[in-house]
Interface confidence: low
Amino acid sequence: HPEPHTAELQLNLTVPRKDPTLRWGAGPALGRSFTHGPELDKGQLRIHRDGIYMVHIQVTLAICSSTTASRHHPTTLAVGICSPASRSISLLRLSFHQGCTIASQRLTPLARGDTLCTNLTGTLLPSRNTDETFFGVQWVRP
Amino acid sequence: HPEPHTAELQLNLTVPRKDPTLRWGAGPALGRSFTHGPELDKGQLRIHRDGIYMVHIQVTLAICSSTTASRHHPTTLAVGICSPASRSISLLRLSFHQGCTIASQRLTPLARGDTLCTNLTGTLLPSRNTDETFFGVQWVRP
Amino acid sequence: HPEPHTAELQLNLTVPRKDPTLRWGAGPALGRSFTHGPELDKGQLRIHRDGIYMVHIQVTLAICSSTTASRHHPTTLAVGICSPASRSISLLRLSFHQGCTIASQRLTPLARGDTLCTNLTGTLLPSRNTDETFFGVQWVRP
């Protein structure tokens, strides 16, 4: 196979979030992030090769303690396919409960044109520190 | 490509920790750990091939309950490149808050000669159980 | 190499759990799960190719809050090789403490014929939502 498509993205909030969708970026200005194959469209990741991917994410809440996290519960992160609408599905979901970081990963089939959305519901702010919040995919096999 | 460089390491603390750096080991005496390509130098992992790597870690605190973790907060784990100094950067960071285990993973570019450090700050000790604390890398693409 | 063996499984509880072993399934009826190489045997995953695998898991407890998790502590998840008996070992273990989700991953050598077991000890039930509880493996190298 040609080189596997991969991407590792950093949070790219440039305005206060008015909707739950996290917007991502890649490139020298955003730590050690990159896209090799997949493409960013308005801060969301679009897949360019069919296959099974390992999707991973870590999100840390800013200015957070277990008390904060508990008081502002439920704060939930969901990763899913948001377009095309016909393929819309939640792939991975986690709640923060009394913690300030969630991290997980899973294998999932993705198709060319699938756009991945990451939604953080609740009132707390995600940290933009490049070692605390990141999102990535790695093509594994057809 | 030749076989991807990979390593899976176990904690190799032989004395009480006097500094925050965790020291790792591999081989038959340490569970199912191994190094195929990267090399251990004084308990730290040195990369031998440029590329994008999946770095993953799990650390469990020994003799820990949510009360202990909370009382000894902040206990934080950071994984980073510590040498060469010109490339020093924190790659991945998590705090324990009221939990006793952190686990995460991320894709990151690493270069031949990069040495990875894992620092556990705080007063709690990590568990050496081979299924509770481990650290590894997997080469993904150039 | 031929295509890497991979599997991504969903929880397939059909009866109330009377033993701690989680039973998994794959296929169209269970979200976006699949087996490419490994095989399911009575809800447990059997490996069909020797090599180093990335094993990952996420388990979310059903009807859970940090209070529930704390009150029902210890709730622990362990992933291991359960047969053949000569190779029985715990590979990965996490406790829930005051959280309702655990997620982790590790690299480990597995051999053809190894059967992986996932045991959830405690009184709480795992969520069967396909984006909350899943288990998978990915062959990485010989």
């Epitope: 440039t14 206060p16 979030r17 200015i63 953080l120 009132t123 702010l125 940290s127 933009r128 | 902040p74 | -």
Partner: antibody
């Protein structure tokens, strides 16, 4: 107990410069976003600027953009505001304020200093 | 001209209830404006009371409550006390990246 103590205010001529400082204690300074908010005599509050916890991201009100610079030194638990090209309308009590982190949308100020008065007059 | 509008002054009797409002010069206030309320007594720094429309900050007595009333944000004080006499500022999120404060309401507790 959270304490924020501002200093550096005083009388300055139009076009002049001042540097305000805010010394923080009683909390882990390096994890909080910090802000400057000002209040002209007998008037309401006006948000001036904020900086993220690690110092890499800053925002400014349009009224001060290009003239004021916010910065921080986490090793000294200190926040700064460098004010250049000062105008009469910058006359105000300047407060250092901590963002509680209660919202991902807006700064919410849960701790304030007592303020330092800046008077711009010829 | 202020974008965020508040009553310049209000009066309440001890033990009484008073509602302070916070509006937009043009348009309605919704929870998407994340209304926040601060209290300031003379010579003191402001103090956070309510955020995200209706969440009380820790240590704030439950006689203070926040809501959306019609097209405005509202701060209601029930069982007013003498030490509630202060100026109250609301803050709204209107545009990136700041908050806009209202001109303040001077509350007098007739004693």
């Amino acid at each position: 107990e959270v304490q924020l103590v501002e200093s550096g205010g005083g009388l300055v001529q139009p076009g002049g410069s001042l540097r305000l400082s805010c010394a923080a204690s009683g909390f882990t300074f390096s994890v909080y976003y910090m802000n400057w908010v000002r209040q002209a005599p007998g008037k309401g509050l006006e948000w001036v600027s904020d900086i993220n916890n690690e110092g890499g991201t800053t925002y400014y009100a349009d009224s001060v953009k290009g003239r004021f610079t916010i910065s921080r030194d986490n090793s000294k638990n200190s926040l700064y505001l460098q004010m250049n090209s000062l105008r009469a309308e910058d006359t105000a009590v300047y407060y250092c304020a901590r963002d509680a982190g209660y919202s991902n949308h807006v700064p919410i100020f849960d701790s304030w200093g007592q303020g330092t008065l800046v008077t711009v007059s010829s | 001209q202020a974008v965020v509008t508040q009553e310049p002054s209000l009066t309440v009797s001890p033990g009484g209830t008073v509602t302070l409002t916070c509006g937009l010069k043009s348009g309605s206030v919704t929870s998407d404006n994340f209304p926040t309320w601060y209290q300031q007594t003379p010579g003191q720094a402001p103090r956070l009371l309510i955020y995200n429309t209706n969440t009380r900050h820790s240590g704030v007595p439950d006689r203070f409550s926040g809501s959306i009333l019609g097209n405005k944000a509202a701060l209601t004080i029930t069982g007013a006390q003498a030490d509630d006499e202060a100026e109250y500022f609301c803050a709204l999120f209107i545009s990136n990246p700041s908050v806009e404060f209202g001109g303040g309401t001077q509350l007098t507790v007739l004693g």
